[in-house]
């Protein structure tokens, strides 16, 4: 960042998207600002328009290509600049040399589905979206289940330390409504962070059979 009150944070989704947030105390809300991306060894560059997300922060997505195309590699470095219009000229507000695969945040897992449900357990699967083939199996997941009367924040986290795109939830209560979420993170990258949580999957356990001990 150019000065102490400015914060410029970006993440690469490992394929064709860099998402950036820029925050600056005292910046004018109606100022027109952009993020410019200049890779060190590619023929293309890209720009996106920063749009306000709160009183003093703006966000935008640099779309580098089709969603599943590998637009940057492990050795690319991208110069990212925040440029704001001041009258007829542009002023640089922030700059960083961005190593894409040190700053990863994958897309949220998709296609959550109940594979099998019983009275006390439920098997759920999902898929990862727009994740680079670079990772092979070196991904980890966190999952959580929302029980009746609790909040997501209270839900204990379950960690899957390998690329396992399913989970068997145990010790559930019969005939009860639950919700389930999962998120993903590569092992690679010093500043890599968890993906957003997936859309919640709602499911209901089977009722206990009458007159039977379950």
């Amino acid at each position: 960042a150019v000065n102490g009150t400015s914060r410029f944070t970006c993440f690469y989704n490992s394929r064709a998207n860099i998402s950036c947030v820029w925050s600056q105390d005292g910046a004018l809300q109606d100022t027109s600002c952009q993020v410019h991306a200049w890779p060190d060894r590619r023929r293309w560059n890209q720009t996106c328009e920063l749009l306000p997300v709160s009183q003093a922060s703006w966000a935008c997505n640099l779309i580098l290509g089709t969603p599943d195309s590998q637009k940057l590699t492990a050795v690319d470095i991208v110069t990212l600049r925040v440029m704001c219009r001041e009258g007829v000229r542009w002023r640089m507000m922030a700059i960083q040399d961005f190593k894409p695969f040190e700053n990863l945040r994958l897309m949220a897992p998709i296609s959550l589905q109940v594979v099998h449900v019983e009275t006390h357990r439920c098997n759920i699967s999902w898929k990862i979206s727009q994740a680079s083939h670079y990772f092979e199996r070196h991904l980890e997941f966190e999952a959580r289940t929302l029980s009746p009367g609790h909040t997501w924040e209270e839900a204990p986290l379950m960690t899957l330390k390998q690329k396992q795109e399913w989970i068997c939830l145990e010790t559930l209560t019969p005939d009860t409504q639950y919700e389930f979420q999962v998120r993903v993170k590569p092992l690679q990258g010093e500043f890599t962070t968890w993906s957003p949580w997936s859309q919640p999957l709602a499911f209901r356990t089977k009722p206990a059979a009458l007159g039977k001990d379950t």
Epitope: S69, Q70, T73, A74, V75, H133, Y134, F135, E136
Partner: antibody, heavy 117, light 107 residues
């Protein structure tokens, strides 16, 4: 089972070119990276470069980029490494390996190249 | 280019004892450090990734740790099959580079 099987030992004269093959099985070659590593007696392990079969891109280490060419034939699941203008210091074992860009998960058995006049 | 320095060059340890191998990077490499084992006449085998993450199928006696630019591979109780050469490798800056190796021999 993941396997990388390399071509046999080669003896070459200085100034010649060598081309080594690496036939893979047990994984999807089209969505993989294949790397090449040199292990010379006095120099240890040196990463030469890789080919990304999905993106169709190659990356070469500066110390090799003038003389090395890495290619792949996705119809036969085979990668190739060609090293030109051979000199005696190129006498080494050459390995192909599979991995993400950052480390090498599976290795071929190695191909010995001897450069001698 | 980042230089990886391994120490000692040779380490003599008795079976059943603990072995500690060191690898130092010439500049900060975060946790981008990986360990391999190589036996005579064989290709290297990946043991540990990102400083401390074990690869599946590798015995639990192998563990890794990091302190700044210094990385350590520990083998808690040496088995006869563990005597080999161990290499570290950085993946922070291209070209990725290996250490010169530590030969672990039977005392």
């Amino acid at each position: 089972e993941v396997q990388l099987v390399q071509s046999g030992a080669e003896v070459k004269k200085p100034g010649a070119t060598v081309k080594i093959s690496c036939k893979v099985s047990g994984f999807n070659f089209k969505y993989s990276l294949i790397h090449w590593v040199q292990q010379a007696p006095g120099k240890g392990l040196e990463w030469m470069g890789w080919i990304d079969n999905e993106a169709g891109e190659t990356e070469y280490a500066p110390g090799f980029q003038d003389r090395v060419t890495i290619t792949a034939d996705t119809s036969t699941d085979t990668a190739y490494m060609e090293l030109s203008s051979l000199r005696s210091e190129d006498t080494a074992v050459y390995y192909c390996a599979r991995g993400g860009p950052w480390f090498l998960s599976y290795w071929g058995q190695g191909t010995t190249v001897t450069v001698s006049s | 280019e980042i230089v990886m320095t391994q120490s000692p060059a040779t380490l003599s340890v008795s079976p059943g004892e603990r072995a500690t191998l060191s690898c130092r990077a010439s500049q900060i490499i975060s946790n981008n450090l990986h360990w391999y084992q190589q036996k005579p006449g064989q290709a290297p085998r990946l043991l540990i990734i990102y400083g401390l993450q074990s690869i599946s199928g590798i015995p639990a006696r192998f563990s890794g740790s990091r302190s700044g630019t210094e990385f350590t591979l520990t083998i808690s109780s040496l088995q006869s099959e563990d005597f080999a050469v161990y290499f570290c490798q950085q993946s922070n800056n291209w070209p990725y580079t290996f250490g010169q190796g530590t030969k672990l021999e039977i005392k």
